[in-house]
C-alpha cells in the first residue's frame, strides 16, 4: 500500500468519484448520488418484455474493467458505457441497444453474435 504524502489511498484513483445512480443506488447513496473508487456507468438493456431500461450508478474498482468491457451475453441485448473523467460524468453517457440482426439468433447461443457500442472513457 502507498503511504507517501502524494497518494495515501491504496487504490488506482487518489480520490473518490461521485456518480449519478438510477435503478442501481446502493444503501450508502444520497440523493441519487453514489460514490466509488472505480467508475461511473450507464447501461441500457431490454427487460423480459423487450422494453429498453436505462440504469446508471457506480462500479467499484474490483472487477469494473471486466464489467465496462461489455462482454456479450447470449440472447440479451444490452450496452454499457463507463467513465471516470469527472463527477457525475455518467449523466452524459447515452449507450444505445445494439441492432437486432436475424442471424444473431439462428444457430443458438454457440454461434451467437452480439453487436454492441462501447465507449470506455479514461
Amino acid at each position: 500500500k502507498k503511504e507517501d504524502g502524494e497518494s495515501t489511498a491504496p487504490t488506482a484513483r487518489p480520490k473518490v468519484l461521485r456518480c449519478k445512480c438510477h435503478h442501481h443506488c446502493p444503501e450508502d447513496s444520497v440523493n441519487n448520488i453514489c460514490s466509488t473508487d472505480g467508475y461511473c456507468f450507464t447501461m441500457i438493456e431490454e427487460d423480459d418484455s423487450g422494453t429498453p431500461v436505462v440504469t446508471s450508478g457506480c462500479l467499484g474498482l474490483e472487477g469494473s474493467d471486466f464489467q465496462c468491457r461489455d462482454t456479450p451475453i447470449p440472447h440479451q441485448r444490452r450496452s454499457i458505457e463507463c467513465c471516470t473523467e469527472r463527477n457525475e460524468c455518467n449523466k452524459d453517457l447515452h449507450p444505445t441497444l445494439p441492432p437486432l440482426k436475424d442471424r444473431d439468433f439462428v444457430d443458438g447461443p454457440i454461434h451467437h453474435k452480439h453487436h454492441h457500442h462501447h465507449h470506455h472513457h479514461h
Epitope: E62, R86, N87
Partner: antibody
Framework: QVQLQQPGAELVKPGASVKLSCKAS????????MQWVKQRPGQGLEWIGE????????LYNQKFKDKATLTVDTSSSTAYMQLSSLTSEDSAVYYC?????????WGQGTTLTVSS | DAVMTQSPLSLPVSLGDQASISCRSS???????????LHWYLQKPGQSPKLLIY???NRFSGVPDRFSGSGSGTDFTLKISRVEAEDLGVYFC?????????FGSGTKLEIK
C-alpha cells in the same frame, strides 16, 4: 510536503459574511477533494462539505447548505469557504482538509469570532 | 446520519500502559465497494487533528507501530500498546462511508 495554509483568525460582525481561504501546496491540487470542518470550543468536529477542484463539484452537509459556499481557484491552488448571515453560533475553528477516501492532512485552522 | 459513539469519554492512563478506545456506529460502515471507511485521528491542544489509522487498520505514514486499529461493521477499536507522553490528547474516530461524514465526540487520553 503537503501543506494547507489558513489564516489564524478572523473577526466579523453579526449578519456579515466572511470568506475563509486555504492555500494548498506539496501535491497536485486537483487530485484530491478539499473538505471543510467546523470545531466549536470544547465540542466535536462537524463536516461542512467538500469540493473537487478538478470540476468544482460540491457536496454539502444539509445542515450547512444555506450557510456555506465552497469554491476553488485552481490557478493559485486555493480553496475558499464563504459563510453568510453570521451569528455567534458560527464562532468556531474552521479547518480545511485534504480528502481522497479519508482526510490525511489538515490545515491549522482559522478561528472565526463573530462579535459586535 | 451515521452517529459515531466513542467510549470512554476520558481515559486516564499511566505511561507504558495499554490504552483501548471504542467507536461504535449507528449503521454499518461497509461501503458498497466493499471498503470500510473508518479512520482515527489524534488532536493535541491548540493543534489540528492528525491522521493515525485509515480504513480500520492501516497505519498512516510516520505513525508508530504501537498504534493499531481493528473492527468491522459497526464496532471498531483503537489500541495503543505502550502509552508515551506524546500520545496524550483527544482521539476521534471518523467515517467517510455515508454522507454526511461524521465524527465521534472524542476520547481524552490523560495521565492518571
Amino acid at each position: 510536503q503537503v501543506q494547507l495554509q489558513q489564516p489564524g483568525a478572523e473577526l466579523v460582525k453579526p449578519g456579515a459574511s466572511v470568506k475563509l481561504s486555504c492555500k494548498a501546496s506539496g501535491y497536485t491540487f486537483t487530485n484530491y477533494w478539499m473538505q471543510w470542518v467546523k470545531q466549536r470550543p470544547g465540542q466535536g468536529l462537524e463536516w461542512i462539505g467538500e469540493i473537487d477542484p478538478s470540476d468544482r463539484y460540491t457536496l454539502y452537509n444539509q445542515k450547512f447548505k444555506d450557510k456555506a459556499t465552497l469554491t476553488v481557484d485552481t490557478s493559485s491552488s486555493t480553496a475558499y469557504m464563504q459563510l453568510s448571515s453570521l451569528t455567534s453560533e458560527d464562532s468556531a475553528v474552521y479547518y480545511c482538509a485534504r480528502f481522497g477516501y479519508y482526510v490525511d492532512y489538515w490545515g491549522q485552522g482559522t478561528t472565526l469570532t463573530v462579535s459586535s | 446520519d451515521a452517529v459515531m459513539t466513542q467510549s470512554p469519554l476520558s481515559l486516564p492512563v499511566s505511561l507504558g500502559d495499554q490504552a483501548s478506545i471504542s467507536c461504535r456506529s449507528s449503521q454499518s460502515l461497509v461501503h458498497s465497494t466493499g471498503n470500510t471507511y473508518l479512520h482515527w485521528y489524534l488532536q493535541k491542544p491548540g493543534q489540528s487533528p492528525k491522521l493515525l489509522i485509515y480504513k480500520v487498520s492501516n497505519r498512516f505514514s510516520g505513525v508508530p507501530d504501537r498504534f493499531s486499529g481493528s473492527g468491522s461493521g459497526t464496532d471498531f477499536t483503537l489500541k495503543i500498546s505502550r502509552v508515551e507522553a506524546e500520545d496524550l490528547g483527544v482521539y476521534f474516530c471518523s467515517q467517510t462511508t455515508h454522507v454526511p461524514f461524521t465524527f465521534g465526540s472524542g476520547t481524552k487520553l490523560e495521565i492518571k
